[in-house]
């Protein structure tokens, strides 16, 4: 069971300091941006991280949403990353959810965060290079210290 607590507005960066944003085609990618660029590209660079009380505490349970034309919430259903047109719900009556991720700090690096899928244990959000782009995917953690699954989260409230 997950019960919604408070939400915060955040900018999410990969360890190359690239900013996560949603383009016009609702596609998530990471791009080089200054703090000023990130503000200028709002709301597509501003993510709503909603925190949830977890009946089985396993880290901070969160949903990740963005409000462009409509509110879309990140999903890892079927191990496929997509943004679904939906508001983060107030309650989720299950111990797993495609839209719930466990946000945890990386041991020894308090400012670095990982987001593990609650539906697929051991699968994390990752920034992976494809062609000349850094895309957001879901990735199984295969080796310790994998930088692609580490992010910084900067509160904008």
């Amino acid at each position: 069971y997950f019960g919604k607590l408070e939400s915060k507005l955040s900018v999410i960066r990969n360890l190359n300091d690239q900013v996560l944003f949603i383009d016009q085609g609702n596609r998530p990618l990471f791009e080089d941006m200054t703090d000023s660029d990130a503000r200028d590209n709002a709301p597509r660079t501003i993510f709503i991280i909603s925190m949830y009380k977890d009946s089985q505490p396993r880290g901070m349970a969160v949903t990740i949403s963005v409000k462009a034309e409509k509110i879309s919430t990140l999903s890892a259903e079927n191990k496929i990353i997509s943004f679904k047109e939906m508001n983060p719900p107030d309650n989720i009556k299950d111990t797993k959810s495609d839209i719930i991720f466990f946000q945890r700090s990386v041991p020894g690096h308090d400012n670095k965060m990982q987001f593990e899928s609650s539906s697929y244990e051991g699968y994390f959000l990752a920034a992976e290079k494809e062609r000349d782009l850094f895309k957001l995917i879901l990735k199984k953690e295969d080796e310790l210290g994998d930088r692609s699954i580490m992010f910084t989260v900067q509160n904008e409230d």
């Epitope: 191990k79 496929i80 879901l138 199984k140």
Partner: antibody
Framework: EVQLVQSGTEVKKPGESLKISCKGS????????IGWVRQMPGKGLEWMGF????????RYSPTFQGQVTISADKSFNTAFLQWSSLKASDTAMYYC??????????????WGQGTMVTVSS | EIVMTQSPATLSVSPGERATLSCRAS??????LAWYQQKPGQAPRLFIY???TRATDIPARFSGSGSGTEFTLTISSLQSEDFAVYYC??????????FGQGTRLEIK
């Protein structure tokens, strides 16, 4: 370059076995589903099944369940489609295709060049 | 399974003219529809996803519309390279995806 490269043309006799391959490169192969699609001569596209190379989870179309086996070897970034006993009606072009994630979710965003399989006595 | 029906089976249009291809789903699929182009001897290529969004590098003359059960692919001014077979595909209840039977777009 992001691509899927399939094995070459096959000519087989009815009753023979066959395994064709699809090798991904230029992306994290273990993080995307691969689908197999059949196209019989002069016909349309039919989905056969999916595999997630990261953990070898498979999903089959009811039409093809029990008729073919889909597998993967993640150490070689390769997916496979195999038959234990071919029939003349298996003659077709077989495509592997990547299922989009993040970008183009649930669609086939990258396709292999196809493997033509001919089964004839 | 969701049945996808495309019409017409063959469409003859002159270069420079507009082409309109239709795709109907047997039940509502929201906007979970893709369009692919296939040329002879080639693999299909993704053109449109979520019913109306063009994939990377797809020309602006291609546009998709519709939601629910009725969908349309429109090519505003046909170029010679556009003559091909077009398939729609639903992914509303993935992994049970289904394709339409295709529309052959030929030169009039």
């Amino acid at each position: 370059e992001v691509q899927l490269v399939q094995s070459g043309t096959e000519v087989k006799k009815p009753g023979e076995s066959l395994k064709i391959s699809c090798k991904g490169s230029g992306y994290t192969v273990t993080s995307y589903w691969i689908g197999w699609v059949r196209q019989m001569p002069g016909k349309g596209l039919e989905w056969m099944g999916f595999i997630y190379p990261g953990d070898s989870e498979t999903r089959y179309s009811p039409t093809f369940q029990g008729q073919v086996t889909i597998s993967a070897d993640k150490s070689f970034n390769t997916a496979f489609l195999q038959w234990s006993s071919l029939k003349a009606s298996d003659t077709a072009m077989y495509y592997c295709a990547r299922v989009g994630s993040g970008w183009y979710p649930y669609t086939f965003d990258i396709w292999g060049q196809g493997t033509m399989v001919t089964v004839s006595s | 399974e969701i049945v996808m029906t495309q019409s017409p089976a063959t469409l003859s249009v002159s270069p420079g003219e507009r082409a309109t291809l239709s795709c109907r789903a047997s039940e509502s699929i929201s906007s979970n529809l893709a369009w692919y182009q296939q040329k002879p001897g080639q693999a299909p290529r993704l053109f449109i996803y979520t019913a109306s969004t063009r994939a990377t590098d797809i020309p602006a003359r291609f546009s998709g519309s519709g939601s629910g059960t009725e969908f349309t692919l429109t090519i505003s001014s046909l170029q010679s390279e556009d003559f091909a077979v077009y398939y729609c595909q639903q992914y509303n209840n993935w992994p049970s995806i289904t394709f339409g039977q295709g529309t052959r777009l030929e030169i009039k």
